[in-house]
Interface confidence: medium
């Protein structure tokens, strides 16, 4: 009883060796075919014929311009990629028989998707924006919003954004704030000069005025008569048949010459102006 | 409008010069990167320069560098490409172009022939 399955395993194993089972898988770098396990072929090389009980697999390099890069049983090699100039591209790297060409974009141009089947020109930042990570083969120009404090007023792929003038350093004054897309407008400090110089004008000139009043009224005599010095300005007056003459200017002068001395009241002054009017 | 108007164009020997001009009007032709691009017959449109703005920033062509030089004149408006050492490869008609995220605007071009 013991002897028959030791008698099945024998017959079992000749008549395995007679017929062998059909394999239901190959190993690596094998592709199964015809109930039979043949040899791929190898990166570089196309498949010519299957392999038979009496012949190994048949491979044929691939021709120029043609590529696998893999262990397999490829009738047809690939071509190489053509990096087409019309595109905006140019060959990084040559391909060989078991390697495709890469392709890069032209300097100024970047990679449409990681394949680099096209290339599209660098965008240029707007005004407004600045260049804060300039393009490269395979990535777009990153633009930034220009911060408070730096501007940039041009459409640029290479731009930076600038700082805005500083006024001070120029011993200037702002006149017009700047933004992100305008400089700062720096102009010379004659308002705030104008705000404490008129009134030191003011007071020195009414100071004056005072000491003026006060040696006349020390100088004059009770007999005086008032007409007098009310008449001695005429004699500076302009006639008006001058060509050209323009009495508006003396008294002008007068002024921002501080020396209002010859019109103490400004009488005539002000009859001028009317004359010529 | 906007116009841009290329000239300068010509025959030119292999090892020869030539300086092509650009003048541009109806745009703010100070705020813009410029660019040259270049046609070789039956090729397709090649980028040959660009600069910035305001000029301080140049780019070339690997094919071109060391030989052409680019530059602007924003008071005149216009755009300049000094093109040294020319070679046969270099014959195309060259057009000047406004650009920002595509070229938006064109020059109808001027004939670079170089030849002996």
């Known amino acids: 009883m013991v002897r028959l399955p030791l008698q099945c395993v024998l017959w079992g194993c000749l008549l395995t060796a007679v017929h062998p089972e059909p394999p239901t898988a190959c190993r690596e770098k094998q592709y199964l075919i015809n109930s039979q396990c043949c040899s791929l072929c190898q990166p570089g090389q196309k498949l010519v014929s299957d392999c038979t009980e009496f012949t190994e697999t048949e491979c044929l390099p691939c021709g120029e311009s043609e590529f696998l890069d893999t262990w397999n049983r490829e009738t047809h090699c690939h071509q190489h990629k053509y990096c087409d100039p019309n595109l905006g591209l140019r060959v990084q790297q040559k391909g060989t028989s078991e390697t495709d060409t890469i392709c890069t974009c032209e300097e100024g141009w970047h990679c449409t998707s990681e394949a680099c089947e096209s290339c599209v020109l660098h965008r240029s930042c707007s005004p407004g924006f600045g260049v804060k990570q300039i393009a490269t083969g395979v990535s777009d120009t990153i633009c930034e919003p220009c911060p408070v404090g730096f501007f940039s007023n041009v459409s640029s792929a290479f731009e930076k954004c600038h700082p805005w003038t500083s006024c001070e350093t120029k011993d200037l004054v702002v006149q017009q704030a700047g933004t992100n897309k305008t400089d700062v407008v720096c102009g010379p400090q004659d308002r705030l000069r104008a705000l404490v110089v008129i009134p030191i004008i003011f007071g020195i000139l009414f100071a004056i005025l005072l000491v003026l009043v006060f040696i006349k009224k020390v100088a004059k005599k009770p007999t005086n008569k008032a007409p007098h010095p009310k008449q001695e300005p005429q004699e500076i007056n302009f006639p008006d048949d001058l060509p050209g003459s323009n009495t508006a200017a003396p008294v002008q002068e007068t002024l921002h010459g501080c020396q209002p001395v010859t019109q103490e009241d400004g009488k005539e002054s002000r009859i001028s102006v009317q004359e010529r009017q | 409008e906007m116009q841009l108007l290329e000239s300068g164009g010509g025959l030119v020997q292999p090892g020869g010069s030539l300086r092509l001009s650009c003048a541009a009007s109806?745009?703010?032709?100070?705020?813009?990167?410029m660019y040259w691009v270049r046609q070789a017959p039956g090729k397709g449109l090649e980028w040959v320069s660009k600069?910035?703005?305001?000029?301080?920033?140049?780019y070339y062509a690997d094919s071109v560098k060391g030989r052409f030089t680019i530059s602007r004149d924003n008071s005149k408006n216009t755009l300049y490409l000094q093109m040294n050492s020319l070679r046969a490869e270099d014959t195309a008609v060259y057009y000047c172009?406004?650009?920002?995220?595509?070229?938006?605007?064109w020059g109808q071009g001027t004939l670079v022939t170089v030849s002996s």
């Open positions: 172009a406004k650009y920002q995220t595509h070229f938006d605007y």
């Open positions: 109806g745009f703010t032709f100070a705020t813009y990167d």
């Open positions: 600069i910035s703005p305001n000029g301080w920033s140049t």
